[in-house]
């Protein structure tokens, strides 16, 4: 079973676009688009700060921290209304991700 050019292996993702803009109040806003080939029961998400295929039920329930979206050693917390999550580094710096 050989992959055709441009075809992703099942269960993997690749970053398609990464836009950084609008450095407001010392905050950089980044928008990332990924292309994923997910297995049955999975959906595109984020694991260890990279695009990944995750359990589809995580997306349905908006339990974003169940994707393990933060880097190892960072703390994950849900935003109010489960609109996204924050990753808190050991030094206290917080990275916020909102889902759209």
């Amino acid at each position: 079973q050989f992959l055709k050019e441009g075809q992703l292996a099942a269960g993997t993702c690749e970053i398609v676009t990464l836009d950084r803009c609008c450095n407001k109040n010392r905050r950089t806003i980044a928008r990332q688009t990924a292309r994923c080939a997910c297995r049955k029961g999975q959906i595109a998400g984020t694991t260890r700060a990279r695009p990944a295929c995750v359990d589809a039920r995580i997306i349905k329930t908006k339990q974003w921290c169940d994707m393990l979206p933060c880097l190892e050693g960072e703390g994950c917390d849900l935003l109010i209304n489960r609109s996204g999550w924050t990753c808190t580094q050991p030094g206290g710096r917080i990275k916020t991700t909102t889902v759209s």
């Epitope: 292996a9 099942a10 269960g11 297995r39 049955k40 029961g41 694991t47 260890r48 995580i58 339990q63 921290c65 169940d66 393990l68 933060c70 190892e72 050693g73 960072e74 703390g75 994950c76």
Partner: antibody
């Protein structure tokens, strides 16, 4: 980074037993935590998994027989009503992508009259 | 539910020889397969994930291959310390499943 199981002992059939898994060197909330068992001289059997939120999934044969729960520092496995078939070494193991990169040394549970 | 058939159940190999262990899945698992080594009285240790990705610290004589439903663990230039039981594990979906194991004896 390591895992250690505790709580294994000789129990009589029907007496509930809780096993505990303690992590060192990493946060349990950054991983999916699993319980796997191995009967003497037999193969490995996956029992179930717990997510950071507390969501659990079990093998079909394990539903109703086992309960996985967690605190901020430990993951527990309750054997609700042990039978002789539950005599085994119980391992906790961590995963991110579905394979187990760190295992505890295991704790032996013997179910006998 | 996924079923993994591991063959052979046991084998004997000579130091320096090659060992091949097969794992047949009951359905396509899209390369979501891992291999473990287990020695008596010890927990399993991860050798290979994603069919062919060697874990850090694992000797390069271990290799994995396969796709779809057929997967293979190969130990080239077998050493005495490779005597152990080897398990395959599929993780394409729940429940996570193990093969029955292959006991490798070194002559």
């Amino acid at each position: 980074q390591s895992l250690e199981e505790s709580g294994g002992r000789l129990v009589t059939p029907g007496t509930p037993l809780t096993l505990t898994c303690t992590a060192s060197g990493f946060s349990l909330s950054s991983y999916y935590m699993n319980w796997v068992r191995q009967a003497p001289g037999k193969g490995l059997e996956w029992i179930g998994i717990i997510y950071p939120s507390g969501t659990t999934y079990y093998a079909g044969w394990a539903k109703g027989r086992f309960t996985i729960s967690k605190t901020s520092t430990t993951v527990d496995l309750k054997i609700t009503s042990p039978t002789s078939e539950d005599t085994a070494t119980y391992f906790c193991a961590r995963t991110v992508s579905g394979y187990f990169d760190i295992w505890g040394p295991g704790t032996l549970v013997t179910v006998s009259l | 539910e996924l079923d993994l058939t591991q063959t052979p159940p046991s084998l004997s190999a000579s130091v320096g020889g090659t060992v091949t262990i097969n794992c047949l899945a009951s359905e396509d698992i899209y390369s979501a397969l891992a291999w473990y080594q287990q020695k008596p009285g010890k927990p399993p240790t991860l050798l290979i994930s994603g069919t062919s990705n060697l874990e850090s610290g694992v000797p390069p004589r271990f290799s994995g291959s396969g796709s779809g439903t057929d997967y293979t663990l190969t130990i080239g230039g077998v050493q005495a310390e490779d005597a152990a039981t080897y398990f395959c594990q599929g993780y394409s979906s729940y429940p996570l499943t193990f093969g029955a194991g292959t006991n490798v004896e070194i002559k």
